[in-house]
């Protein structure tokens, strides 16, 4: 019962996490104009991984895609790559984990196969979450560096008269979505790995042979000497595995993922 719950919860948490990673990757607000001393602005700039946008006071918003690959900063390319790798791994992980779910019966799939698939998807979720967290963190670091650089030369005076105010950028909503989503995917992956341990069938026991002095026919008794021989002594696993109370129709319903704004 606990294994199914852990596996199911891990799947749902990862699903929400990956949906969040996809949302963060698509969002335009990775960096937003810093309104350091002017909370109300007539022109508001914000940037994403794929395009930069400008919102005017009237509400009119204009976005321009980055139509160049070579002209983009290497760091931005790296962040894009990390996020895409995270999404791809997460998507594959989700696909694998669907078939690995204890509550879903597919043909005569053995528990050992389901355990392996659960572990595989768990590892994929962990790597996916780490990729997202790394991508967002690299971008955040890039922002912090640029922020202080632009603060240092905030006003570049031309003859001391004309001022060119440099636009400073700060953390956008997508960074927080990415961090949270990456963390959820990571947690979901860990839960899947934990569930895998519970799903793994017991080690193969040697079939104990009972010898009788009378020379009667040999009786094979599976697990007969378990307590005394030390074979298959993983009682913890046995307890969970032989719980018996677990049914195939114990499918829990989980809340659906809500899109941001």
């Amino acid at each position: 019962m606990a294994v199914t719950a852990c596996q199911g919860l891990g799947f749902v948490v990862s699903l929400i996490g990956i949906a969040g990673i996809i949302a963060a990757t698509c969002m335009d607000q990775w960096s937003t104009q810093d309104l350091y001393n002017n909370p109300v602005t007539a022109v508001f700039n914000y940037q994403g991984l794929w395009r930069s946008c400008v919102r005017e006071s009237s509400g009119f918003t204009e976005c321009r895609g980055y139509f160049t690959l070579l002209g983009l900063p290497a760091m931005l390319q790296a962040v894009r790559a990390l996020m895409i790798v995270g999404i791809v791994l997460g998507a594959i992980g989700l696909l694998v984990s669907i078939f690995a779910l204890k509550c879903i019966r597919i043909g005569s799939m053995e528990d050992s196969a389901k355990a392996n698939m659960t572990l595989t998807s768990g590892i994929m979720f962990i790597v996916s979450g780490l990729c997202a967290i790394a991508g967002v963190s690299v971008f955040a670091n890039m922002l912090v560096t640029n922020f202080w650089m632009s603060t240092a030369n905030m006003y570049t005076g031309m003859g001391g008269m004309v001022q060119t105010v440099q636009t400073r950028y700060t953390f956008g909503a997508a960074l927080f979505v990415g961090w949270v989503a990456g963390g959820l995917t990571l947690i979901g992956g860990v839960m899947m790995c934990i569930a895998c341990r519970g799903l793994a069938p017991e080690e193969t026991n040697y079939k104990a042979v009972s010898y009788h002095a009378s020379g009667h026919s040999v009786a094979y008794k599976p697990g007969g000497f378990k307590a005394s021989t030390g074979f298959g002594s993983n009682t913890k696993n046995k307890k969970i595995y032989d719980g018996g109370a677990r049914t195939e129709d114990e499918v829990q319903s989980y809340p659906s993922k809500h899109d941001y704004v």
Partner: antibody, heavy 120, light 113 residues
């Protein structure tokens, strides 16, 4: 066609308040930001603030903050600008103008203006 | 606040001649996010409200004759009337549309010589 029709001229005493209306027609009222600009006799133009008719959100020039209040009546597609604690230097023609959505924050339509005279 | 300075204060030009008005801002009106300049030009005739001529420093408003041309970027802008007509006699204002508070130039009066 787009029209912005303002209320008539007003004569006020110093310390009093004035409320100027601007009735709009010919376009979707809540889709465009409305601005107020004033012009003292023989002087240049001075931006006072603006209001988003959809949310009722306002942005005021620091110079007028605390003295100016901009409101909207969506049922009649009318914008109001109230200026309190009037002084003689507030004597001016007050214009309402529409922010031309996608026109880089420029004002594409203007009211005919309302002359407010502050005199004791 | 951004200070807008127009020059000259007044301008007398013969009919059919070119009139050039300059506008200088104390801060750049260029927005790097969309590579646009946030400057507008208005024409005001006596007893009338201002009329939008140019927005985004160089884009002509619909219905405005093509003899009106806006140019410039950053802090220096120009309004050119290629061939002055009698109906162009007015006061011309430039406006900072980049940052609050919106500010206007003091105006340039164009007359016929």
């Amino acid at each position: 066609q787009v029209q912005l029709v303002q209320s008539g001229a007003e004569v006020k005493k110093p310390g009093a308040s004035v409320k100027v209306s601007c009735k709009t027609s010919g376009y979707s009222f809540t889709d465009y930001l409305m601005l107020w600009v004033r012009q003292a006799p023989g002087q240049g133009l001075e931006w006072m603030g603006n209001i988003n008719p959809y949310y009722g959100r306002t942005t005021y020039a620091l110079k007028f903050k605390g003295r100016v209040t901009m409101t909207v009546d969506r049922s009649t597609s009318t914008v109001y600008m109230e200026l309190s604690s009037l002084r003689s230097e507030d004597t001016a023609v007050y214009y309402c103008a529409r922010d031309g959505y996608s026109l880089r924050n420029a004002m594409d339509y203007w009211g005919q203006g309302t002359l407010v005279t502050v005199s004791s | 606040d951004i200070v807008m300075t127009q020059s000259p204060y007044s301008l007398a030009v013969s009919l059919g001649e070119r009139a050039t008005i300059n506008c200088k801002s104390s801060q750049s009106l260029f927005n790097s996010g969309n590579q646009k300049n946030y400057l507008a030009w208005y024409q005001q005739k006596p007893g009338q409200p201002p009329k939008l001529l140019i927005y985004g420093a160089s884009t002509r408003e619909s219905g405005v004759p093509d003899r009106f041309t806006g140019s410039g970027s950053g802090t220096d802008f120009t309004l050119t009337i290629s061939s002055l007509q009698a109906e162009d006699v007015a006061v011309y204002y430039c406006q900072n549309a980049h940052s609050y508070p919106y500010t206007f130039g003091q105006g340039t009066k164009v007359e016929i010589k």
